[in-house]
């Protein structure tokens, strides 16, 4: 059976970025079209064939080149990827005898956690303030050494594209965590960082 | 530096047989379109037969069924087998490398080896 | 297949005046909005040299003095200004369909 293989790739913001397409049981394409998806029709943004060789649309001139130059594997790369980058995109190969057989690669852009942990004595209680920005939206959990502490979460999404999550512990007799290791965890894209503060009286 | 060397031209007989071979260095052979061209003893150019990257091959009607073009990737030569050779085929036979992000233009090419058809 | 026809088939111009030669097309050579032709230059001796690709674009390397313009079926190669240098022919070559065809050349010299 004729088909196109192809998978989705995770890349970190302004970093480069590569989607292939593999035309599986089938001879070399005539020609190999990139498109991306959008909401009304899809956009040409480059092109490969024997006789015309790369052939990029204006608007992806100095953002994409097709890296792996093949009519049965082709590579897009993207140098720099940024927001307006995440989405799907297809790769249409035109053959003879089959007609065009078409494949989905999505990009999905992320940025790593930015974490700031720091706390605040008052009177009669300590707030510890973990904060963390990152695309997609982080977690923030809490170890500490004793149960029962309170905690409040607020979320805010940027205009960015990222997302950050704020998480304060609310400690209402603060002398008792004096010298003692407060954790706050951020989990990510399934990894978990530990991020560690140990509370001094000031 | 991108070099590329032909060799194997001669005085050939006509309906007779020759290779071709071109040997390429200073880039990766095999990413690239690689193609024979020739220039008549009027200086006419003419493009004789092209090797994708892929492998797919291409040639002149006039040449179909005469000319078979080839290539060693992990020698970087280019080959061009001609047989039954007419005086019209009597040329200088350059290799030439098609860049496929400038249009497939011939971008380098070899000093060029010369055969002759004639009897 | 598509013919190619360069006009003049040689001129002579002065040394830092411009020349400029003519490739028509007997059919369009454009697709997906680029027009597949390109020029070159071959001295006497030597094979030829990439000098324009895609109608417009300056081969690296190539002096700014020449430059490509045209698009569908008619193209020029302009150099301004000559120098001695240049005393050459000059071929246009289209890729946008097999057989890839060239011009019959121009041959320029320095008057």
């Known amino acids: 059976q004729v088909q196109v293989v192809t998978q989705d790739e995770r890349e970190q913001l302004y970093t480069p970025a590569s989607l292939k397409c593999s035309l599986q049981n089938a001879q070399e394409a005539l020609i190999v079209t990139w498109q991306k998806k959008k909401a009304v029709s899809p956009e040409n943004m480059v092109t490969f064939s024997e006789n015309h060789g790369v052939v990029i649309q204006p608007a992806y001139k100095d953002k994409i080149n097709i890296t792996q130059l093949g009519l049965q594997n082709s590579t897009i790369t993207f140098w720099n990827i940024t927001l307006e980058d995440e989405g799907c995109y297809m790769c249409l190969f035109n053959t003879f005898g089959f007609g065009k057989i078409s494949g989905t690669a999505c990009l999905t852009v992320y940025v790593q956690p930015i974490v700031s942990l720091h706390y605040k004595f008052s009177e009669d209680h300590l707030n510890i303030t973990c904060s963390a920005t990152a695309r997609p939206a982080p977690m923030v959990f809490w170890k500490v050494p004793r149960s029962g502490i309170e905690n409040s979460t607020v979320t805010l999404s940027h205009p960015n594209g990222t997302t950050s999550v704020t998480s304060i512990l609310h400690i209402k007799d603060p002398k008792n965590q004096v010298g003692k290791e407060v954790i706050c965890q951020v989990l990510h894209l399934g990894t978990v960082t530990d991020f560690k503060q140990t509370v001094n009286k000031g | 530096e991108v070099k590329l060397v032909e060799s194997g031209g001669g005085l050939v007989k006509p309906g007779g047989s020759l290779k071709l071979s071109c040997a390429a260095s200073?880039?990766?052979?095999?990413?690239?379109?690689m193609s024979w061209v020739r220039q008549t003893p009027e200086k006419r150019l003419e493009w004789v037969a092209s090797?994708?990257?892929?492998?797919?091959?291409y040639y002149l009607d006039s040449v179909k069924g005469r000319f078979t073009i080839s290539r060693d990737i992990a020698r970087n030569i280019l080959y061009l087998q001609m047989s039954s050779l007419r005086s019209e085929d009597t040329a200088m036979y350059y290799c030439?490398?098609?860049?496929?992000?400038?249009?497939?233009?011939?971008?380098?090419w070899g000093q060029g080896t010369t055969l002759t058809v004639s009897s | 297949d598509i013919v190619l026809t360069q006009s003049p088939a040689s001129l002579a111009v002065s040394l830092g005046q411009r020349a400029t030669i003519s490739c028509r097309a007997s059919?369009?050579?454009?697709?997906?909005?680029?027009?597949?032709m390109h020029w070159y230059q071959q001295k006497p001796g030597q094979p030829p040299k990439l000098l324009i690709y895609?109608?417009?674009n300056l081969e690296s390397g190539i002096p700014a003095r020449f430059s490509g313009s045209g698009s569908r079926t008619d193209f020029t190669l302009t150099i301004n200004p000559v120098e001695a240098d240049d005393v050459a022919t000059y071929y246009c070559?289209?890729?946008?369909?097999?057989?890839?065809?060239f011009g019959g050349g121009t041959k320029l010299e320095i008057k």
């Open positions: 030439a490398r098609g860049n496929y992000y400038s249009g497939t233009s011939y971008d380098y």
């Open positions: 200073g880039f990766t052979f095999s990413g690239f379109a």
């Open positions: 090797i994708s990257s892929g492998g797919t091959t």
């Open positions: 059919e369009s050579v454009d697709s997906y909005g680029n027009s597949f």
């Open positions: 895609r109608a417009s």
């Open positions: 070559q289209q890729s946008n369909e097999d057989p890839r065809t």
